[in-house]
Interface confidence: medium
């Protein structure tokens, strides 16, 4: 059997095996998916789901995979300027971005900001930020576009037109995108160009009251959705969101933590144990949450998981 779909070397695939008694499918995991991030070793899992007798297509996933956030971070705010936003709501988005930038002003973060609606406008790029690290001044001429919500196009615009060395992006930096929107996309397409960007999405307001509407945001965010998609019912709650982001992007207060002292999924060893029943896979993550351990509930396609 030829296994495709992973850029990582797997040494221990099959160390964990589980079969589904209902249809004979097999889950094979390697809990030793190892890589280095700023001198820290990350350890998570790599799992494959095979049909009975190893026939037909197989699924591959990386449960508990923690993205590497290196010392230098280039962060783009991609913020909604559609007509459904009231000026006070739009102002709260600007205030949130300013707050993040002010709190991270003495770190290895660089910022850029893009407003999107029907079209896209770079309000300031990384070079502008380096020249003048004053968020109030950088955002004082933002003109609310008041048109549609072309999210697919906007993400592609950021990937191709903002993360550019000639505009101040650093080749060694981790690319992070924070998308802030109050509505579902009015365009369609794919975001393949942004695959190497860590993507958070914040959906705010009355248009995200249903589970279906919330799930429309998942395709724009990195996985797992539980980590990278945030739904807020009011714009006021943006004020409290920074603390949560700070926990997620753990190097947020300095240049680079060379020696991690607390862990979420960095050393999860997910896939150390597994259960498969009626097509539903659960894997053990012994090193999660400072080695408190726990289980990861895998989605059917193995592309997402919940702790």
């Amino acid at each position: 059997v030829t296994l495709r779909g992973s850029n990582y070397t797997s040494k221990y695939l099959g160390m964990t095996l589980a079969t589904d008694p209902t249809d004979g499918s097999i889950l094979a995991c390697d809990p030793g998916l190892s890589r280095t991030c700023d001198q820290n070793t990350y350890l998570s899992g790599l799992c494959y789901l095979f049909r009975q007798n190893l026939q037909g297509p197989m699924l591959q996933g990386r449960p508990g995979f923690q993205e590497c956030i290196k010392g230098n971070v280039d962060l783009v705010f991609l913020f909604d300027g559609s007509m459904s936003l009231q000026p006070d709501e739009f102002q709260k988005i600007l205030d949130f971005m300013k707050d993040v930038m002010k709190k991270l002003s003495n770190t290895s973060y660089q910022f850029a900001a893009v407003q999107f609606s029907t079209s896209y406008k770079t309000e300031f790029d990384f070079s502008d930020y380096v020249k003048r690290k004053d968020p109030d001044a950088l955002l004082k001429h933002v003109k609310h576009m008041l048109l549609l919500t072309n999210t697919f196009g906007a993400i592609n615009y950021v990937a191709t037109e903002v993360f550019r060395e000639e505009l101040g992006a650093r080749p060694d930096a981790t690319k992070v995108l924070i998308i802030i929107t109050d509505g579902e996309a009015t365009d369609s397409g794919n975001i393949d160009a942004a695959k190497d960007i860590i993507r958070y999405i914040i959906g705010i307001g009355k248009h995200f009251q249903t589970k279906e509407s919330q799930e429309t945001l998942h395709k724009f965010a990195s996985k797992p959705a539980s980590e990278f998609v945030k739904i807020l019912d009011t714009f006021e709650k943006l004020k409290d969101l920074f603390t949560e982001l700070q926990k997620k992007i753990y190097v947020i207060e300095g240049t680079s933590k060379q020696d991690l002292t607390s862990f979420n999924m960095e050393l999860s060893s997910s896939g150390i144990s597994a259960d498969l029943s009626r097509g539903h896979a659960v894997v053990g993550a012994v090193g999660a949450k400072d080695w408190a351990g726990g289980f990861l509930d895998l989605k059917a396609d193995l592309q997402d998981d919940t702790f």
Partner: antibody, heavy 121, light 107 residues
């Protein structure tokens, strides 16, 4: 609570320079344009201009370009308007007002009480 | 500059009545008109912006309509505290300009 505090009255002699003040509180002073508006006795409102406290960028109504100079002091969250060579024509109520920069221009969501300037010999 | 003509200059009405104040711009200003209330001893209050959007905290008896050059502020079922001076302001282009004002008096 957003507040813009202005002195109630100023009395000046013609020709003497006058500097009107507006102290802001209850919001991020450097995050909003500060505007100045004039109201002469028995007349309507006239927009003088606006300043952004973050970097003191100023936009003035051409009508007031030789009359008004706008400044800010970030440390005290205060905005100032200096009127050059005041005459009795400059006697008016002067308001400061916080601007909401919307679709490229501005309307005002909070106003000061206004300073009544009397220029008289 | 955009000139704004506001009418009427004076308006007398009784509590419970519905009144309308008009503003006409010398050229099209799209929908970008704001309305303010001025009362002695109080700071000016923003009522409406963008022609028809009610500022938060303003009672729903205030409403705005119009686009292009002609705009209307309507106050339905007048309350005693509504008797005041009203101004419109265009926020479509610089320099920002105001209407001449309407004094709403108790009949």
């Amino acid at each position: 609570e957003v507040q813009l505090q202005q002195p109630g009255a100023e009395l000046m002699r013609p020709g003497a320079s006058v500097k009107l003040s507006c102290k802001a509180s209850g919001y991020s002073f450097t995050g909003h344009w500060m505007n100045w508006v004039r109201q002469r006795p028995g007349q309507g409102l006239e927009w003088i201009g606006m300043i952004h406290p973050s970097d003191s960028e100023t936009r003035l109504n051409q009508k007031f370009k030789d009359k008004a100079t706008l400044t800010v002091d970030k440390s005290s969250s205060s905005a100032y308007m200096q009127l050059s060579s005041p005459t009795s024509e400059d006697s008016a109520v002067y308001y400061c007002a916080r601007g909401i920069y919307f679709y490229g221009t501005t309307y005002f969501d909070y106003w000061g009480q206004g300073t009544t300037l009397t220029v008289s010999s | 500059d955009v000139q704004i003509t506001q009418s009427p200059s004076y308006l007398a009405a009784s509590p419970g009545e519905t009144i309308s104040i008009n503003c006409r711009a010398s050229k099209t200003i799209s929908k970008y008109l704001a309305w303010y209330q001025e009362k002695p001893g109080k700071t000016n209050k923003l009522l409406i912006y963008s022609g028809s959007t009610l500022q938060s905290g303003i009672p729903s008896r205030f409403s705005g309509s119009g686009s292009g050059t002609d705009f209307t502020l309507t106050i339905s079922s007048l309350e005693p505290e509504d008797f005041a001076m009203y101004y419109c302001q265009q926020h479509n282009e610089y320099p920002l300009t105001f209407g001449t004002g309407t004094k709403l008096e108790l009949k």
